[in-house]
Interface confidence: low
């Protein structure tokens, strides 16, 4: 489908005469008839197979014709066709004189023809105008013509239909040859497929509009190239969705069990050596001069009571020094110059001679020690209490004061948080790593099931025979309002059939 356009530019009839040579009165009021037909080697009479068009009176004798396409006029003249343009044509242009206003052929005198031209040839579809001028003895006509495709038709013969669109069925404009040219961001045969965000993973991502990247289930990230691990996975990763592969030092289904407390928390202080001893459990081996569960306490070298026989210890920069009591000498006052005759044993200790009286040894009663029974026994020096428990001397024995969550003689046992039945109103207790959780029975809520919530006693539809049920919020019980003809706490008995009471 297309249009043959003819642009009349100038007609010259200087003498104002008809083809017969007779002058027009008062001048030749000129209009044109145009015939477009198939190619003929010799243009001959016959039907105008491609169409005809007539103009109004355009001027008298000689005149120029204005291009009036923008103003809605009829120059260029339009000869539309609804077939494939064959590339060849024949064109006949007649100039006629109109004595009156009626331009119909039958209303014109037989000699009203001013001039007639006929051309034929090849014409390709295109935007460029072909300029032509035809001259006879009395007249001259200057005109130009071209063939263009109708809207939405393309190609060398205007035979290719293409309508630009930007909707669900395609996003494209048409190229001069009628092929589709996708709008930016679209691809595919009909430009229906959006081009996703650059780098969007081919399998794990998709898009419904250009430059978008929507992730399929199990994937995340701007480009949908990161898998989503199992819900609740704490210290783990995935290579496919819903996995939870634990990082080093972590274990359990959700990788939330710390198998390497030493590395993750570095609890041991002052250069102590840390040893993992189970989940969230560790032991610190202290360097000399330090003590405490985490070796956080600095020991004075005198704290170990190195001086024997009542010697007093003095801290020094490079160690310590023992000041020995009379009768003793040596680095730790370990050598005696005394004998049993000097009664060297304190606190009821009994003296035994050694080496023919050159030396002695004290046998101490319970609770005392030292070479002269001068020291009260401290049963806490070996740090017997585990898990940060505090050691207390209690006369001849010792005891451990445990940190919350631990029990046992040496605080070696974990206490279950649920052991003290913290859940009220029959709630079920669940031990968690960092505390506990209560599952409350119906009618109760709160962290410890301590909050009473009202129960809709009517929820179970306890009333019969279409009775109306009301909930007593103060007692969480129900009351049935019976319809006429029924009685009973649940309206279960018809009137006239009283229940059989046991009394």
């Amino acid at each position: 489908s297309g249009v043959f356009q003819l642009q009349l530019q100038e007609f010259i009839n200087e003498r104002g005469v008809l083809a017969s040579g007779r002058p027009c009165e008062p001048g030749c009021r000129t209009f044109f008839r145009v015939c477009l037909k198939h190619f003929q080697a010799v243009v001959s009479p016959g039907p105008c197979t491609f169409g005809t068009v007539s103009t109004p009176v355009l001027g008298t004798n000689s005149f120029a014709v204005r291009d009036d396409s923008s103003g809605g006029g009829r120059n260029p003249l339009q000869l539309p066709f609804n077939f494939t343009w064959p590339g060849t044509f024949s064109l006949i242009i007649e100039a006629w004189h109109a004595p009156g206003d009626d331009l119909r052929p039958e209303a014109l005198p037989p000699d009203a023809l001013i001039s007639k031209i006929a051309i034929q040839g090849s014409l390709a579809v295109g935007q460029n105008w072909l300029l032509d001028e035809q001259t006879s003895t009395l007249t001259r006509l200057r005109y130009s013509y071209r063939v263009i495709c109708s809207d939405n038709y393309y190609g060398d013969n205007c035979s290719r239909l293409c309508k630009k669109r930007n909707d669900h069925f395609g996003h494209y404009v048409c190229q001069p040859d009628g092929n589709l040219s996708c709008l930016p961001g679209w691809t595919g045969e009909y430009c229906q497929q959006p081009i996703c965000l650059s780098g969007c993973h081919e399998q794990n991502g998709y898009c419904s509009k250009p430059a978008e990247c929507l992730c399929r289930p199990g994937w995340q990230g701007r480009l949908c190239n990161e898998c989503i691990p199992h819900n609740g996975c704490r210290h783990g990763t995935c290579s496919t969705p819903w996995q939870c592969t634990c990082d080093e030092g972590w274990g359990g289904l959700f990788c939330d069990q710390d198998l390497n407390y030493c590395t993750h928390h570095s609890p041991c202080k002052n250069g102590a050596t840390c040893s993992n001893s189970g989940q969230r459990s560790y032991t610190c081996t202290c360097r000399p001069g330090y003590t405490g569960v985490d070796c956080e306490l600095e020991l004075s070298e005198c704290d170990s009571n190195p001086c024997r026989n009542g010697g007093s210890c003095k801290d020094q920069e490079d160690g310590y020094h023992c000041l020995c009591p009379p009768g003793y000498y040596g680095l730790h006052c370990e050598h005696s110059t005394l004998s049993c005759a000097d009664s060297p044993c304190f606190n009821g200790g009994s003296c035994r001679e050694r080496n023919q009286g050159a030396n002695y040894a004290c046998e101490c009663p319970p609770n005392f020690t030292g070479s002269n029974c001068e020291k009260k026994v401290d049963r806490c020096t070996s740090n017997p209490c585990a898990n940060g428990g505090q050691c207390l001397n209690r006369g001849p024995s010792r005891m451990c004061r445990c940190r919350p969550g631990f029990t046992g003689t040496y605080c070696e046992l974990h206490v279950s948080d649920c052991a003290r039945n913290p859940c009220a109103h029959g709630g079920t207790c669940h031990d968690l790593e960092n505390g506990l959780m209560c599952t409350c029975p119906a009618g109760f809520s709160g962290r410890r099931c301590e909050v009473r919530t009202s129960i809709d006693a009517c929820a179970s539809s306890p009333c019969f025979n279409r009775a109306t049920c009301y909930t007593d919020l103060s007692t969480d019980t129900f009351v049935c309002n019976c319809p006429y003809g029924f009685v009973g706490s649940r309206c279960e008995f018809p009137v006239g059939l009283p229940p059989s009471f046991p009394w």
């Epitope: 000129t30 109004p56 355009l58 008298t60 005149f63 120029a64 014709v65 009036d68 103003g71 120059n75």
Partner: nanobody, 120 residues
């Protein structure tokens, strides 16, 4: 007898203004399409502007659009061309023309012309 007489031509500086008049006798201007054409030395006659007889629609050549204005005074049977901001390339003989055919700018009857020279 149809007669068209142009006036108002002369020397004008670039950027100045000039008004050409076309007075008609022998017919009523308001019924017909009337236009202005011009011809510079050694060049073809060029259509400038046109005002239709039916509804007073106006048309202008691209070269003068926005600078020239065509108007008509039916009482005086006169058509005017107001030339604002003329350029040196507007120098030409300006002709008033009458079309008896239709509202298209044809030139059936001509005046004698008036010279316009744009120069500083």
């Amino acid at each position: 007898e149809v007669q068209l007489v142009e006036s108002g031509g002369g020397l004008v500086q670039p950027g100045g203004s000039l008004r050409l008049s076309c007075a008609a006798s022998g017919f009523t201007l308001g019924v017909y399409a009337t236009g202005w054409f011009r011809q510079a030395p050694g060049k073809e006659r060029e259509w400038v502007s046109c005002i239709s007889g039916s509804d007073g629609s106006t048309w202008y050549a691209d070269s003068v659009k926005g600078r020239f204005t065509i108007s008509r005074d039916n009482a005086k049977n006169t058509v005017y061309l107001q030339m604002n901001s003329p350029k040196s390339e507007d120098t030409a003989v300006y002709y008033c023309a009458l079309s008896l055919g239709s509202s298209w700018c044809a030139y059936d009857y001509w005046g004698q012309g008036t010279q316009v020279t744009v120069s500083s």
